[in-house]
Interface confidence: low
């Protein structure tokens, strides 16, 4: 910003310093320089002198007009050519912004990731506003009527310790910026219904050379939730379409899931879980790759997830754990 200039005059914008993108705007500059009757007044946008649409209004004032202004931000300042001054004299400067009022926030979602100690609330903010937009998340207890408000620029993490008003809450989001304010619909939540189990992780895979070769995927979670439903999806890396298997799971021991796969093909696996009967799923786990052997048994462990495959022998390879799923935000 250039709001701290020691001004020798005044610069202002009509209709306002922050305005709706695409509007026609006027920028006025009025000089108040000692011993100077300006010969000429100049406008600069982002340091570049403007040459068109400038109108001299009177001895000390000029107007710059922009049609359909589309830049999100610009730094404007104006200068005067004073007689007996070799250089232009700075009059004043102003930062201007254009953008949009916020859309109504929708798809408000609140979840508690097991062990996180937080309720995480997110929403779809709608189209880009281009200007500073703040969100106020309202959390109101349906039991005590007590309401808490949280100011944020995006999503919010609310400590579950601060949710002292029982289990049932209403949550809604207000979006506000200089051009407008909107409010979401209210979401009713029960804290017990929004817990997402601790992440499920695929640790290794092996293909057993039986009459029909069988691949076993080993996977686990640290969840303490008793009734958990999971999905494992898999596909050949050359395919677009996923196959999905469903499981009712008890994580008191490592899970083993069996697949009958084509030989000598590279497959990718992912898993996700939810508390049985509840609404929200985990994001899909990291991509886990396994190449089925031509005929000889092969093991792939979570530790070995490079794209290097030894043909013929049992392979163990180590995963860095940084591969991410293609839709890691899928919790709905």
């Amino acid at each position: 910003g250039i709001t701290n200039i020691n001004c020798s005059g005044h610069i202002w914008v009509e209709p306002a310093t922050i305005f709706k993108m695409g509007m026609n705007i006027s920028i006025y500059c009025q000089a108040a320089i000692k011993n100077c009757q300006p010969r000429k007044l100049h406008f600069y946008k982002n340091g570049i002198k403007e040459r068109f649409q400038i109108t001299r209004i009177n001895k000390t004032t000029a107007r710059l007009w922009y049609k359909n202004f589309l830049e999100p931000h610009a730094s404007m300042y104006c200068t005067a050519e004073c007689p007996k001054h070799f250089q232009e004299t700075l009059i004043c400067g102003k930062d201007i912004s254009s953008g949009y009022p916020p859309d109504i926030p929708d798809e408000v979602t609140c979840v508690i990731y097991e062990y996180s100690g937080n309720m995480t609330c997110t929403w779809n903010a709608g189209k880009l506003t281009y200007i500073d937009t703040k969100y106020v998340v309202h959390v109101k207890s349906l039991e005590t009527e007590e309401e808490q408000q949280y100011l944020t620029s995006s999503y919010i993490n609310i400590s579950t310790d601060s949710l002292q008003g029982g289990k049932k809450y209403l949550v809604w989001v207000q979006a506000a910026n200089a051009l407008g304010m909107e409010e979401s619909k209210q979401l009713q939540i029960h804290l017990d219904d929004i817990v997402i189990p601790s992440a499920a992780v695929i640790s290794r895979a092996e293909t057993i050379n039986a009459t029909v070769p069988k691949t076993i995927i080993y996977w686990d979670s640290q969840t303490t939730i008793e009734k958990v439903s999971c999905e494992m999806r898999y596909k050949a890396t050359t395919n677009q379409t996923w196959n999905v298997k469903e499981f009712d799971t008890n994580f008191t021991y490592v899970q083993q899931s069996e697949f009958y796969l084509e030989p000598n093909i590279k497959y990718v696996f992912q898993v996700r879980c939810q508390e049985t009967g509840k609404r929200y799923w985990q994001p899909w786990s990291s991509l886990f790759f396994h190449k089925t052997p031509e005929t000889v048994p092969q093991v792939t462990s979570k530790a070995f997830q490079h794209d290097t495959w030894n043909s013929g022998l049992t392979v163990a390879s180590i995963s860095t754990g940084h591969l991410t799923s293609d839709n890691r935000g899928d919790i709905g």
Epitope: G1, I2, T3, N4, I5, Y44, N46, G47, A74, S75, Y77, Q87, E88, L90, G93, D95
Partner: nanobody
């Protein structure tokens, strides 16, 4: 971030002159603006003069107009503040600063690069 080192401060009598130098650790981009700020004890840090490298556009605070001159040497990557007709009220720590924003003179907090400061004392 560009490292800036000032030099040239000292004690001078009222009416005298000093030349401050500010050397940058690396070549600055053409959109770069260099400035000299000063801070007297108990006062805020104020911009004294600024120069934009792309077109040599300069700015001076009213209190120093006609007495101070800001200039630069591209080859040496250095900015100078020539201070003539010094007054007792010019006594302060002088800081060199720089930024690459499009605005010539953003608020103090927008200047990301700062020198360590050099003391200028003007005695009567």
């Amino acid at each position: 971030e560009v490292q800036l080192v000032e030099s040239g401060g000292g004690l001078v009598q009222a009416g005298g002159s000093l030349r401050l130098s500010c050397a940058a650790s690396e070549r600055t981009v053409s959109t770069y603006t260099s400035g000299w700020f000063r801070q007297a004890p108990g006062k805020e840090r104020d911009l004294v003069a600024a120069i934009r490298w792309s077109d040599d556009f300069t700015y001076y605070a009213d209190s120093v107009k006609g007495r101070f001159t800001i200039s630069r040497d591209n080859a040496k990557n250095t900015v100078y503040l020539q201070m003539n007709s010094l007054k007792v009220e010019d006594t302060a720590v002088y800081y060199c600063a720089g930024h690459s924003f499009s605005a010539l003179i953003p608020p103090v907090s927008f200047w990301p690069s700062w020198g360590q400061g050099t003391q200028v004392t003007v005695s009567s």
